[in-house]
């Protein structure tokens, strides 16, 4: 039961996290005009990964997409890439984890396969979360650098060109959404990996095993390390965790082809 709960919770947390990463990537408010200690304007500027917007006090909002690829800063391109990689990995992870869920039975899929899938999806969620956190952090660092540069030089002018008040940008809502979403995806991934550890030993956690060796019978309940007799498929020493109290997961035990030798 604990394994199922951990796996299910990990899936849900990751799902929320990935939804958040998608939302953050699509949001326009990655950077917003800094209003502190600035002349108060009737126009509010904010920028996203894909377009920049201007909202007038009347409520009129105009957004313009970045229709160039080569003209964009390399850092912005890197952030875009990180967020997209995060989304793709997260989406694949979600797909894999659906089939890995213990509560969903697909054909005669063994627990070992589900354990592997759980681990795979968990790793994917961890990498996805890290990508999102990295992307948002890179953008935040870029903002901080630009903020202090524009603070040092509030007014810029080039040659005979018009002097323009440099608009300073600060952290937008999307950054916080991205950080939280990345963190949730990461946590969900870790939970999936933990759930995998609980799933993996179950294939060898037998209720009763009968060994016929050297003419005499040895029947025992597993506990501690299982003796390696060279029979069956269990040739490796595996620690069987048996706390005495049985969970619901352990109640239903179907005989496998290796149960009897």
């Amino acid at each position: 039961m604990a394994v199922t709960a951990c796996q299910g919770l990990g899936f849900v947390v990751s799902l929320i996290g990935i939804a958040g990463i998608i939302a953050a990537t699509c949001m326009d408010q990655w950077s917003t005009q800094d209003l502190y200690n600035n002349p108060v304007t009737a126009v509010f500027n904010y920028q996203g990964l894909w377009r920049s917007c201007v909202r007038e006090s009347s409520g009129f909002t105009e957004c313009r997409g970045y229709f160039t690829l080569l003209g964009l800063p390399a850092m912005l391109q890197a952030v875009r890439a990180l967020m997209i990689v995060g989304i793709v990995l997260g989406a694949i992870g979600l797909l894999v984890s659906i089939f890995a869920l213990k509560c969903i039975r697909i054909g005669s899929m063994e627990d070992s396969a589900k354990a592997n899938m759980t681990l795979t999806s968990g790793i994917m969620f961890i990498v996805s979360g890290l990508c999102a956190i990295a992307g948002v952090s890179v953008f935040a660092n870029m903002l901080v650098t630009n903020f202090w540069m524009s603070t040092a030089n509030m007014y810029t002018g080039m040659g005979g060109m018009v002097q323009t008040v440099q608009t300073r940008y600060t952290f937008g809502a999307a950054l916080f959404v991205g950080w939280v979403a990345g963190g949730l995806t990461l946590i969900g991934g870790v939970m999936m990996c933990i759930a995998c550890r609980g799933l993996a030993p179950e294939e060898t956690n037998y209720k009763a095993v009968s060994y016929h060796a050297s003419g005499h019978s040895v029947a025992y309940k597993p506990g501690g390390f299982k003796a390696s007799t060279g029979f069956g498929s269990n040739t490796k020493n595996k620690k069987i965790y048996d706390g005495g109290a049985r969970t619901e997961d352990e109640v239903q035990s179907y005989p496998s082809k290796h149960d009897y030798v």
């Epitope: 005009q33 002349p39 108060v40 304007t41 009737a42 126009v43 500027n45 920028q47 920049s52 917007c53 201007v54 007038e56 006090s57 009347s58 409520g59 009129f60 105009e62 313009r64 018009v162 002097q163 323009t164 008040v165 440099q166 608009t167």
Partner: antibody, heavy 118, light 113 residues
């Protein structure tokens, strides 16, 4: 059609208060911002204050301490509360609707005259 | 506060001839986000309320004759009347529509010679 009608003007003694009203029709005050602009006799236009559709307000810094802009959404009416009036506040007071684009003022009322005199 | 300076104070014109009014702001009215200049032009005809002519420095308000055109960027702006008509007389005002408080220029009185 869009119409703005100012009222409440008149002769008032220095130091006294006065409340101007601006009845709007043809649009909602919760959709468009409305400004107050004044014009002293024979002088140019002077921006007084604005209340935006969302309810936020901005003032002429020189008048902020004495003037308050407000509105009654149910009556679709705008108000300008003027306290501690001075002789230099004598002017025609216009209310004007904020254009949806460019922060301009696209519709103006006919104005109401306020005379501050002892 | 932003200071708006208009010139000339008075502009006598001949009907059918072009006219030009200048407006300078103490700070740029150009918004870097959308590359638009938040400068507005108004005309106040004698005995009337002002009317909006141009916003965003160069975009004509609907219903305004196309003989009126606005140009300029940053701090220097110009209103041009390609062919002045008798009905164009009045006082022209430019307005800062970017920084609070919004401020108007002193006005330019256009009159027929």
């Amino acid at each position: 059609q869009v119409q703005l009608v100012e009222s409440g003007g008149g002769v008032v003694q220095p130091g006294r208060s006065l409340r101007l009203s601006c009845a709007a029709s043809g649009f909602s005050l919760t959709t468009y911002g409305v400004h107050w602009v004044r014009q002293a006799p024979g002088k140019g236009l002077e921006w007084v204050a604005v209340i935006w559709a969302g309810g936020s307000t901005n003032y002429n810094s020189a008048l902020m301490s004495r003037f308050t802009i407000s509105r009654d959404n149910s009556k679709n009416t705008l108000y300008l509360q003027m306290n501690s009036l001075r002789a230099e506040d004598t002017a025609v007071y216009y209310c004007a609707r904020a254009a949806y684009y460019g922060n301009g003022l696209d519709y103006w009322g006919q104005g109401t005259m306020v005379t501050v005199s002892s | 506060d932003i200071v708006m300076t208009q010139s000339p104070l008075s502009l006598p014109v001949t009907p059918g001839e072009p006219a030009s009014i200048s407006c300078k702001s103490s700070q740029t009215l150009l918004n870097s986000g959308n590359q638009k200049n938040y400068l507005t032009w108004y005309l106040q005809k004698p005995g009337q309320s002002p009317q909006l002519l141009i916003y965003w420095a160069s975009t004509g308000e609907s219903g305004v004759p196309d003989r009126f055109s606005g140009s300029g960027s940053g701090t220097d702006f110009t209103l041009k009347i390609s062919r002045v008509e008798a009905e164009d007389v009045g006082v022209y005002y430019c307005q800062n529509a970017y920084f609070y408080p919004f401020t108007f220029g002193g006005g330019t009185k256009v009159e027929i010679k």
